[in-house]
Every structure is written in C-alpha cells, then in structure tokens.
Interface confidence: low
Amino acid sequence: NEHDDCQVTNPSTGHLFDLSSLSGRAGFTAAYSEKGLVYMSICGENENCPPGVGACFGQTRISVGKANKRLRYVDQVLQLVYKDGSPCPSKSGLSYKSVISFVCRPEAGPTNRPMLISLDKQTCTLFFSWHTPLACEQATECSVRNGSSIVDLSPLIHRTGGYEAYDESEDDASDTNPDFYINICQPLNPMHGVPCPAGAAVCKVPIDGPPIDIGRVAGPPILNPIANEIYLNFESSTPCLADKHFNYTSLIAFHCKRGVSMGTPKLLRTSECDFVFEWETPVVCPDEVRMDGCTLTDEQLLYSFNLSSLSTSTFKVTRDSRTYSVGVCTFAVGPEQGGCKDGGVCLLSGTKGASFGRLQSMKLDYRHQDEAVVLSYVNGDRCPPETDDGVPCVFPFIFNGKSYEECIIESRAKLWCSTTADYDRDHEWGFCRHSNSYRTSSIIFKCDEDEDIGRPQVFSEVRGCDVTFEWKTKVVCPP
C-alpha cells in the first residue's frame, strides 16, 4: 500500500489512486493562521523552496520536509510524508516534518488546495489536509431513472462482506458452502477465509480451487422498460475456462417484490462463460414513506409502523458515565428539569443537559437494508470541542493523575485536550477548537418478538456529537 510514483493502490479493492496531476514545481500555498503561507508541491520539489524541498515556510523558506513521491494508503486516506526538514527550533535533534493527507471529496470544493490543519509543537510536525476527488475510488452510480422517479439500489450494497448465492444445479448436497459471493455497485468487502480477488464484485468459489473473479462493476444500473426489469452488468478480466477468448461476465436482473424482506440474489441460469442472477426485492418497487404523527407508512412494504405506544414515557440510558434521556415523539425531559430545551434526546448532566436534536426536527424513515424503522433528531446543541486537526477530544481524560472534563491550559500555552482517555499513558493530544456542528441522534428500531416495549441501548457515540441508539421491540415487527 505504498508506491514511489505518486500513485498508490487500495490493497483491498485494487483501485489505483494517482495524484500526479497535482504535481509541478509551482505547487500550492497553504495559509497558516492569518500570518503567512507554506509553499508546497505534491510529489516533487517546490520552486519557492531550497533544492529538493517539497514544502517550506513562505516567509523564511525554512524547509518543512524533503520532497518524495512515496504515496501511502492508510485507512481510506492517501498520505504523503515529507521528512528531514530544517532543524526544528523547539526540539534539539528533531527536524520539521509535513504530513499531507488526501481525503475523498466527490466534488472539488471552492478551495482546491491543501490546508494547514495543525502544527504539533512536540514533534515539529505540520499536518495538512486536502479534500479532493482524486482521493475517491471511482464511485459508480447505483441508481437509475424510471420516468420521473429514481430507483436507488444503494440500500442493497453490502457494507461488510458480500451476499451469498448457491448453484442449485450442483449435485453435491453435502456441500453447504456458498458458490458465489456478490456485491453491487462496489467491490466485495474483504472476507475472512474467502480470498476473492481484490476489486471483484461477483466471485465464484470452486470446490477445488481458489475463488475467481467473474465480474467487476461495469457501470450503473440499466432499465429495461419493456420487461420492467433493472439490470446490473459485471465484467471480469478472468479468461473463461471453456473459451479462453472470452472473459467471464455476470448479470443481475432485479424484479419488484413488495414486502419486508430485501431479498438476496439467486442464480437463475448459467452458460459456460456467463452467469445470470435474479434478485426479487422491494427496493425496485415504486416507493413512498408517509409520516403521520408517530406513525410511518412504507409503500414498498405495504405496512404502517405505529410508535405511539413508546411515547407515553421517556427512557433513561446509561453508557459509561453518561446518561441520556430518550423521547419517542415526545420531549426527552420535562420543563421542570430544564437544561435541554426542545430536545427529543438529551444528555443529562446535573442541572444542565445537552440536546441531541430538537423534537420539532423529528423524522421517521424505513431503512430497507437493515429492516429497521429509524427515528432521527437534528439541530441539537453545539458539538463539543475537537482538536485543530479535527480529532475529537476525549472527555474525561487523565492528565498528571487528575481527571478533566474540558479543554485545559495547564502546562501548555493554549487550550488543549487529550485525544485518548489517558494522556499520562498515551501522550496523544491537540489544541482545542470550536466545533461548527450541532448534535444529532438516531434511534434504530428493530423487530424483536420477545420484547414488548423494550428499551433503547446506546449503539454508538461519535465525537460527543452524534449518538445512535438501538431499540429492540415488537412494536416495529410486521405482521
């Protein structure tokens, strides 16, 4: 996952990223504070800097890193590291270093250039971020227009592994392993013990050999209005065993089937080099959701979910030391408690409270891929602080044996926080800045016939800014 030519491959998908179009001696400038500029070139030296230097301070021409073309792929981010800059004034033996992270942004923003996010005074490292379409894997459209409406297949994308399909024509009844793994609109995700080729979206698993690629995403869905079918074509670069002049291809035909099941692909027929799958699913049926008070009607499912039995009281949920009050179609806390005005979900804290979304903003939806009713609240209180490079502060954190619930100035010249729960152990920190986001919450209701009312559990918390609850209850079970 590291190349030396301003290119890098995503090892799990085989996608090649190429940033060479950003290279050039003229380079770019990144402003720091209101004070000055850093000159920077991508994958090469900058004409405003000393020879061999990829980035330098504009005012002094002090090098903040030597140029190189070694692009790395790290957790869906492309990274270019310029090391061995000028000696860092604050630390003997350390040299300036620059870390440039390229982050996917499908459409180029108004300022298509690097931004200096932070300067770590301890390590003499400058952190830059560049949001650019060049860091995106080629996103294939996963929808198709049908008259005035759009049919979106993206709820069927498998986010973790792949769908399993079987070849019913094979005689061996003792073999219960899937014969195919399938994903749509994007490659299969890595699966433990199933080494499908990187980038494959349709993968055949022979009994006697390694999995083979029989289809990669070839384009967006296609509508056949006469047959009222939607097709997805897949092409591979794997030569067909029966005829080496051809490569394997696959096709999935989607048909409307209303109901609460999303369906799965099934092998319909196969010739020597082609595989045709059928997928019956409500996703391709004309759809509409209607919200009426605390009731959601989904036209694909032909069913109404009524949550009003959950709105008669609020529910308190505790995760670690944090307690949330959760309301369904009702305020999370009464007016006498205060501190969480208008909130549908509230983080309780003494007499104060933080709203994780206003009741007035409530939306109900049905998420087909999860077979779940989702209630969401938005526009709550402002999110807690984060560091200058966008890493969430972790509260509380331990520093010098004491616990802190907020950014502190102690022993540094500016407000800072730890980015882990124990600074004394990890020494990971950053300077604090305001968040420009507002708190939101979601409640994912899942069917569980054994739970009458049930109760919410904290499913995830993101940056103290977004909380998701999972709530298992028979209230959302279809008949």
Epitope: Y32, S33, K35, T60, P89, S90, K91, L119, K121, P385, D388, E406, C407, I408, I409, E410, S411, R412, A413, K414, L415, C432, R433, H434
Partner: antibody, heavy 119, light 107 residues
Framework: EVQLVESGGGVVQPGGSLRLSCAAS????????MHWVRQAPGKGLEWVAV????????YYADSVKGRFTISRDNSKNTLYLQMNSLRAEDTAVYYC????????????WGQGTTVTVSS | AIRMTQSPSSLSASVGDRVTITCRAS??????LAWYQQKPDKAPKSLIY???SLEDGVPSRFSGSGSGTDFTLTISSLQAEDFATYYC?????????FGQGTKVEIK
C-alpha cells in the same frame, strides 16, 4: 477592522472594587482566548490573566490570584476583569489583548484603561 | 515562573544604525517567544511571534532569531519611527512573563 476597546477604569480606594470591560469587534470573538495585561506607571508589562475561548478555563498571575476574576460574554463580544480587594500596587494601565490562536502570543491589543488605587 | 532578562535596559542609536536587543529565558522555552514595540502612552504592538516570524505589516528591517533560552531582536537600519521600548515575552508556560524592556533612544 479588528478592534479592542477597554472601559471601566477610574480612581478607587484601597480595598475597593472595579470592573473593567473590553469590547471586541471585527473578528469572531468566541473563537479566541483573551488576556488582560497591565503596566504600572513608568514600569514594564505584566501579564494578569487569560480566559479560554468558551470561558471554561482561566489562569491568573500569582499577584492577583483570589482577588481578580476574568470572565467573558460571547453573546456580547465582551471580556471582563472584576477586581476586588484592590491595592496601591494594582495601579496601572490595563490592556486587553487577543491570543493568537495558532502560534501563541498576543497579536491584537486594546488602547488601555487606567486604574488608580489611592486613598 | 520563567524569568525573562533583556539587555541592554536602554541604548542610544542614530537613524540608519543596526540595533540588536537580546533576551534570555531562565529555562528552555523552545521557540515560543514574542517581541512587542511600545511607544509612550500607546498600547504595545506585536512585531514578532514564534521567535522569528514577522507579524503582518511589520517592516522587514525587523527580524528575530534564537531558540531555547537565548533570543535576539535585530533592527537592520533604525528609522525615526523605531524609537520606542521593546519587550520580549515567553508563552511557553503560564504564567506568561515579559522582559523588563529595552528603551531605544535617539543619540
């Protein structure tokens, strides 16, 4: 134009109290830490106190600890210094200053307000 | 608290002279030092931050250098408007502290 304007200075007796204000304009006040710095007549500069951008953290010079309180109202773009138990040695011109968020130091200063502690 | 010692306390110079003021910290403050200029009955004005970086709008005849404990402010060619008092200040650790000042007077 970035501007800081102090007010509230005056003559006060030893042991008395005074509240200084600093009105900010021309920048996003709520994003910056703010400082008070003072200068006794004919003397050098002395840092007095700092408050974080959101008011959650405050630090004081030893000479004023327990007597002075720094605060802010971000909705009014105003910084305050409440001075209690004033002493003759608190006589000075008091400046408010903006903290340079990125590199530290104080990059914008007010014109100052004079506090005289005298019986 | 970190002590900041400036030298000289005062100096006399003529227009066009090269002037150097030094500042010493009682302990390592890396490069977290600022220089300010103050004229009589006026507020201080920030000249240099991070030991060597010039504030916007400050003439290039001013420069700063140093790291650790020893720092220098240099005015390469003194102008009439530069006669003032100059202060160094550390912001490595609270409480922030200033040097006692250097008064630059006309010879």
């Amino acid at each position: 134009e970035v501007q800081l304007v102090e007010s509230g200075g005056g003559v006060v007796q030893p042991g008395g109290s005074l509240r200084l204000s600093c009105a900010a304009s021309g920048f996003t006040f709520s994003s910056y830490a703010m400082h008070w710095v003072r200068q006794a007549p004919g003397k050098g500069l002395e840092w007095v106190a700092v408050i974080s951008y959101d008011g959650s953290n405050k630090y004081y010079a030893d000479s004023v600890k327990g007597r002075f309180t720094i605060s802010r109202d971000n909705s009014k773009n105003t910084l305050y210094l409440q001075m209690n138990s004033l002493r003759a040695e608190d006589t000075a011109v008091y400046y408010c200053a903006r903290d340079d968020r990125f590199f530290g130091g104080m990059d914008v200063w007010g014109q100052g307000t004079t506090v005289t502690v005298s019986s | 608290a970190i002590r900041m010692t400036q030298s000289p306390s005062s100096l006399s110079a003529s227009v066009g002279d090269r002037v150097t003021i030094t500042c010493r910290a009682s302990q390592d403050i890396s490069s977290w030092l600022a220089w300010y200029q103050q004229k009589p009955d006026k507020a201080p004005k920030s000249l240099i931050y991070a030991a060597s970086s010039l504030e916007d709008g400050v003439p290039s005849r001013f420069s700063g250098s140093g790291s650790g404990t020893d720092f220098t402010l240099t005015i390469s060619s003194l102008q009439a408007e530069d006669f003032a008092t100059y202060y160094c200040q550390q912001y490595n650790t609270y409480p922030w502290t200033f040097g006692q000042g250097t008064k630059v007077e006309i010879k």
